[in-house]
Each structure stands twice: as structure tokens, then as C-alpha cells.
């Protein structure tokens, strides 16, 4: 069985304040079953940015339809970027359970925010 990979192809993304940022993430396998979550930061204090299953994330949308059968693209788009959104974002795969168990994290994508062009 091939080991699951969580692929974040861009090490860094730079976006002008006010624009949208796309953070790409794909998985190499549909197995095991379980959700993908996006976090900012890697430590215990990391912030949950997007959870497909539940929660209210008004500025974050999935790029692909996550409910689509055989979907392996878990990229997200964050709208109306502000300087406070800067940081390193991690796409993390969980195994379904009670509670879900963290399996593997992507390498992270650092989001930097440029001043809005005048």
C-alpha cells in the first residue's frame, strides 16, 4: 500500500492586501477515509482555518467541490486578504474516527501579504 502524501506544491505565496489567496493541497490517495483540515501555524496553538465538516469560515471556500466522489483536491481560497492573514498554512489529513486522528500534514505554504498597490 502506497503511503499517503499530502502535497502543498507552493512553499510560499505572495498576495496584495484586499485580493484573494489560493492555497493548493492535493492528496495522493482516497484511503484512509477522513477529513482534511487547514491550519495556520504548526504548534499546539495553531488556528483552525477551514474544516470541511463543520464550522463557520466566511472568507474561506473550497476550490474544488469537496463533496464530489473521488475528490483529491483540497485547495482553498481565502478572500479579502489582510496583513493579519500572513503566516504558514498547513493542509492536514485526518483518519475518520471518534475523535478523528491526525495522519499527515503538508509541508506548509507561507502566505505573505503585500501592501495594496496605490
Amino acid at each position: 500500500e502506497e503511503e499517503l502524501q499530502v502535497i502543498q506544491p507552493e512553499k510560499s505565496v505572495s498576495v496584495a492586501a484586499g485580493d484573494s489567496a489560493t492555497l493548493n493541497c492535493t492528496v495522493s490517495s482516497l484511503i484512509p477515509v477522513g477529513p482534511i483540515q487547514w491550519f495556520r501555524g504548526a504548534g499546539p496553538g495553531r488556528e483552525l482555518i477551514y474544516n470541511l465538516k463543520e464550522g463557520h469560515f466566511p472568507r474561506v471556500t473550497a476550490v474544488s467541490d469537496p463533496t464530489k466522489r473521488n475528490n483529491m483536491d483540497f485547495s482553498i481560497r481565502i478572500s479579502n486578504i489582510t496583513p493579519a492573514d500572513a503566516g504558514t498554512y498547513y493542509c492536514v489529513k485526518f483518519r475518520k474516527g471518534s475523535p478523528d486522528v491526525e495522519l499527515k500534514s503538508g509541508a506548509g505554504t507561507e502566505l505573505s501579504v503585500r501592501a495594496k498597490p496605490s
Partner: antibody
Framework: DVQLVESGGGVVRPGESLRLSCAAS????????MNWVRQAPGEGLEWVSL???????YYADSVKGRFTISRDNSKNTLYLQMNSLRAEDTAVYYC???????????WGLGTLVTVSS | EIVLTQSPGTLSLSPGERATLSCRAS??????LAWYQQKPGQAPRLLIY???TRATGIPDRFSGSGSGTDFTLTINRLEPEDFAVYYC??????????FGGGTKVEIK
Amino acid sequence: DVQLVESGGGVVRPGESLRLSCAASGFTFSNFAMNWVRQAPGEGLEWVSLISVTATTYYADSVKGRFTISRDNSKNTLYLQMNSLRAEDTAVYYCAKVTWNNLFDYWGLGTLVTVSS
Amino acid sequence: EIVLTQSPGTLSLSPGERATLSCRASQPIDSYLAWYQQKPGQAPRLLIYNTVTRATGIPDRFSGSGSGTDFTLTINRLEPEDFAVYYCQHQYDWPPYIFGGGTKVEIK
């Protein structure tokens, strides 16, 4: 406006238990790790415990095995169950929100726990 | 585990003077250092993070500097409301999160 309001403090004897609560409002509680930080009278700040957004828990060595942190995201409430209390646990206990880069950006006003025989 | 040592323990100054507070780490911590202010009977308030970045709403008379093991919080032209206890914190030493022992800035 972010608000953190602690409750449940009081005076107990050594060996007894107490449960602290922290009611959070003004932010999406379930998206953030939460902490308890304490301050003994006239002393500095001591981090006590953290619960992550995925409910992983961390404790200072001084409270490990005696204190249990938990959260109820449906009630926007953080808890600290304190068992086998000792005199050295006497302190003001603050509930604090932590950011992704490990900064304590919002704090409650604290609740005083006094352990005395 | 990293230890943060703050000095002096107490700083006695008059309003309008400059306060220089030190925080020394037992091993290098890059620039991941934060400062908090605590007034009597109040919760701590975040002042500065990543050594030099002021938190939202913090006046520019507060500034941070340093790198490696030696860090400084400077308060230019002390205002009456600045007399308080100041704590440093290593942002990336977790768990546990580590605070310095504090420096009290009192009115002379």
C-alpha cells in the same frame, strides 16, 4: 468584542477539587487553542495548560495528573478540573486565547483559587 | 527547557524618563520574543511580539529590540499609565510556554 469570563474560583482545603469555567464570546471559539495561566499572589505568570483545536491537551509538570483541561465548543466554554489541590496551587487563574504564533492575545480578568487548611 | 531572566527586578523612574528593560534567554531563540504589560488587578496585555512588532493599539513609545539571547523593551517618555509589571515570553517554546519573572516599573 472578544470577552473571556472565568468563574468557579473559591476557597478549598488541600486535597479537595474545584472546577473552573471560562465563557468565551466575540470570536469563533472552536478555531482557537485555549489556555489556563495562573499567577500566585505577588508572583509572575505560570502557564498551566492548553487545549488545541483538535482537543489535544498539554500540561505544566506541576499540575500533570491532577488537572484536566477540556472544552465544549457548542457552549463556547473552556474548563479546568482541578483535583488533589495543594497550597501551592493558590493563584489567580486566567483563561487566555492563544494565536497561531503562540501569543496570548486575549485574557480574562481571572478567578482566585485559594487552597488553605 | 529555555529560561528567561528579566532584569532589573524593579526600575524606579519618573514620568517622562526612558525605561530600558532586559530579557535574557538561556539559549538562542531567534527573534521569537513577546512582551506583556500587567497593571495591578488587571490581566496581562500583549505589547510586542517577534521582538519588534507592536500589537494592535500599542503606542509607538514602546519598542523592542534584540536577537539571539539578549532582548530589550524600551519605553520612551514614560506616561503615568506605563507604570506596571512587564513580562517577556518565548513564543516558540511549547509546551510549556515560558514567561520571564517580570520587571516592575514604579514611580520614583
